[in-house]
């Protein structure tokens, strides 16, 4: 293959891969027809002048996961055909000016996971065809004005995981073609008005895990094409009324892990395409009528781990397409009989870890497609007659950790549970809390005659049986439709693997495993 170095492997497709700790310099001679060169996991510490001079046909060059800390300005001379250059996961602190000069075809430049302390306008001034620039995982503290002014074709810019404390409102002004901007995991406390005004084609903006306290009212008003907006894990305590007003294409909005106390009226909308709204881990105490009424296509609404004690009966107006509603770990004691009336397509609802003492008999009356209901760890002593009768698709019902009162009033519920045991799961069954002589005994097998009879014995001896369709699987707990183990955060749909943080803390929302990844 035109002379393949011994430390490398060369394929017929003009691909060369050189790996291993024994490599301390760019191997030679490299095949003149090489189109792709990867130098990975070596002990190379520097790149000298023109090590790639004889492979001018090179299109992709990956020099990743090495000990590289120094590069001579002329290292990439004669690579005029190069389209992809990755120097990620090295130990670069400084980039020489002119390093990328002559790389007229360069479209992707990956400088992520180094130790870069600064970038300057002169670094990228020659890269007029650049479409993707990855700078995440460095030590950048500021971006000078003009740094990206020549990158007019840039579509993707990642500045995440740096140490940025502020952003100039002018730094992105010429990036009219930018589609993805990632600024997550920095130290930004506020973003000046106008910062994103020039980004008319922006589709994704990642601002999560900063220290942003306040959003300017018109911050996103020019970003009409924005589809994904990540604002989670900041210090946002209030949302200006018009902040999301001009985002008709938005389909995912994450606001979890902030300090929101209330949701201003009309704050969400109109957002006809929003599919997911993540609001867990805030300080929301009540939900007024119509707070989500502009979100006609919303399918996932996560409100868990707040302090919600009151939900107005019209709070969920307009959410006719909602599939998943997470309200667990709040302070709910009461639910108005009409509160879920609009949620005709709801499949999963998690209400566990609240203080519900009773449920209205018609609470699920319009929600015929419910498949999973989480009611564990509340203050329920009984449930109204026939509350689940019409829920033919129900295959998961969690009722444990409630103080069930096993007097004769419990008979209808007990009999229904007996007929529908598979829906309760096998992990934990509901047990009696009172009277004392039956405390701790399974509600399903309890002999109610032993218990103290109640004053009022209902005439109807049992809940009518909800048909248990044989084609509806009774899921064992490990594959439950609405697992009580939950994701900490939505999987933010990144192509850069370095930005995905895998976590095993799945304790945030009660949803389908399909959606919890």
């Amino acid at each position: 293959y035109h002379g393949c170095p011994s430390e490398c492997t060369c394929s017929r497709a003009s691909q060369v891969e050189c790996t291993g700790a024994r490599i301390v310099a760019v191997p030679t001679p490299l095949p003149w027809n090489a189109m792709s060169l990867q130098i990975l996991n070596t002990h190379i510490t520097e790149l000298n002048e023109s090590p790639f001079l004889n492979i001018s046909a090179l299109i992709a060059l990956r020099i990743e996961k090495n000990e590289l800390s120094r590069i001579t300005p002329g290292a990439f001379r004669n690579l005029g055909s190069l389209r992809y250059l990755s120097l990620a996961n090295n130990k670069l602190q400084v980039l020489p000016i002119g390093l990328f000069q002559g790389l007229d075809s360069l479209e992707s430049l990956l400088l992520s996971s180094n130790q870069l302390l600064q970038i300057q306008p002169a670094h990228f001034s020659q890269c007029s065809n650049l479409k993707e620039l990855q700078l995440h995982g460095n030590h950048l503290e500021y971006i000078p004005d003009g740094a990206f002014d020549h990158l007019v074709g840039l579509t993707k810019l990642n500045l995440g995981k740096n140490s940025l404390t502020h952003i100039s409102p002018r730094v992105f002004q010429h990036l009219g073609n930018l589609q993805v901007l990632r600024l997550y995991e920095n130290r930004l406390t506020d973003i000046p008005m106008g910062t994103f005004d020039g980004l008319v084609n922006l589709q994704e903006l990642a601002l999560q895990q900063n220290q942003i306290g306040l959003l300017s009212p018109g911050l996103f008003h020019n970003n009409h094409n924005l589809q994904r907006l990540y604002l989670s894990n900041n210090h946002i305590s209030q949302l200006p009324p018009s902040v999301f007003m001009q985002l008709p294409q938005l389909n995912r909005l994450t606001l979890f892990g902030n300090s929101l106390k209330e949701l201003s009226p009309g704050i969400f909308g109109p957002m006809p395409n929003l599919r997911e709204l993540w609001l867990y881990d805030n300080h929301i105490s009540s939900l007024p009528d119509n707070v989500f009424s502009n979100l006609r296509q919303l399918q996932v609404l996560i409100l868990s781990r707040n302090q919600i004690s009151f939900i107005s009966p019209g709070a969920f107006n307009g959410l006719t397409e909602l599939r998943e509603l997470s309200l667990h770990t709040n302070a709910l004691q009461d639910l108005d009989g009409n509160v879920f009336r609009m949620l005709a397509n709801l499949q999963n609802i998690s209400l566990q870890n609240n203080r519900l003492r009773q449920l209205p008999g018609n609470i699920f009356a319009n929600v015929n497609g419910l498949m999973a209901i989480q009611l564990q760890n509340n203050q329920l002593e009984n449930l109204p007659l026939g509350i689940f009768d019409h829920l033919g698709k129900l295959c998961e019902l969690r009722l444990y950790d409630n103080p069930w009162r096993c007097d004769s009033d419990i008979l209808p519920l007990r009999n229904w549970l007996l007929l529908n045991q598979p829906r309760l799961g096998t992990d934990t069954v509901p047990v009696c809390f009172s009277p004392a002589n039956v405390r701790g005994q399974s509600l399903i097998i309890i002999n109610v005659n032993v218990a103290v009879p109640s004053v009022h014995v209902p005439e109807v001896p049992s809940y009518p049986e909800t048909p248990w369709y044989p084609d509806t699987p009774s899921y064992p707990d490990t594959t439950s439709v609405s697992s009580t183990t939950e994701l900490t955060s939505p999987v933010e749909d990144y192509t850069d693997l370095t930005t995905i943080q895998v976590t095993d803390d799945r304790s945030v929302w009660g949803m389908t495993q399909a959606q919890s990844g």
Epitope: P288, N290, D334, P360
Partner: antibody
């Protein structure tokens, strides 16, 4: 159909208390919030508070806090509003009202006139 | 507390007239505004909820509009039975508050 029937008119002396009842029918009493609203002569309507009959939880307008107590008797499907330390400006018609599909008042009692006079 | 300022406080009109009543909230209440009609000695009757939705049984001549802080109730062609007092109410945040009322009288 939903009906709210209130107790009759009352005349009270300043400093006394009054307890007005509201009997609900036509729906499951414990499942829906019941509110109390008053209207002094020639004045705007004033929301006083609500009760959730299923649990007995209440929320009051700060203006009346400490003087108003809303209770319920689930066996009688009846809500009560007691106002203490009455003053002449408490002379008003007191209404119970139930929300519909939102926190607006769809169903109203006929009203109870409470007159406070020495 | 959110103040609801209604205007005019009274108006005189004839049968067939178009009548417009406005209500201004002291802060943003979204669309969480209701309108009621009250006749002497009677309880208020719900006309409009969520700023623009007619309650069941309410004639189509009644319409509501607005959002945020400015709201309007319109009676397109006044009928004899429409002479009454009209109130707006915000139910976005506690305590729920009402406007001072607009008395519609016969000219």
């Amino acid at each position: 159909q939903v009906q709210l029937v209130q107790s009759g008119a009352e005349v009270k002396k300043p400093g006394a208390s009054v307890k007005v009842s509201c009997k609900a029918s036509g729906y499951t009493f414990t499942d829906y919030y019941i509110n109390w609203v008053r209207q002094a002569p020639g004045q705007r309507l004033e929301w006083m508070g609500w009760i959730y009959p299923g649990s007995g939880n209440t929320k009051y307008n700060e203006k009346f806090k400490g003087r108003v107590t809303i209770t319920r008797d689930t066996s009688a499907s009846t809500a009560y509003m007691e106002l203490s330390s009455l003053r002449s400006e408490d002379t008003a018609v007191y209404y119970c009202a139930r929300w519909g599909y939102g926190a607006y008042f769809t169903y109203w009692g006929q009203g109870t006139l409470v007159t406070v006079s020495s | 507390d959110i103040q609801m300022t209604q205007s005019p406080s009274s108006l005189s009109a004839s049968v067939g007239d178009r009548v417009t009543i406005t209500c201004k909230a002291s802060q943003n209440v979204g669309i969480n505004v209701a309108w009621y009609q009250q006749k002497p000695g009677k309880a208020p009757k719900l006309l409009i909820y969520s700023a623009s939705y007619r309650s069941s049984g309410v004639p189509s001549r009644f319409s509501g509009s607005g959002s945020g802080t400015d709201f309007t109730l319109t009676i397109s062609s006044l009928q004899p039975e429409d002479f009454a007092t009209y109130y707006c109410q915000q139910y976005n945040s506690f305590p729920y508050t009402f406007g001072g009322g607009t008395k519609v009288e016969i000219k």
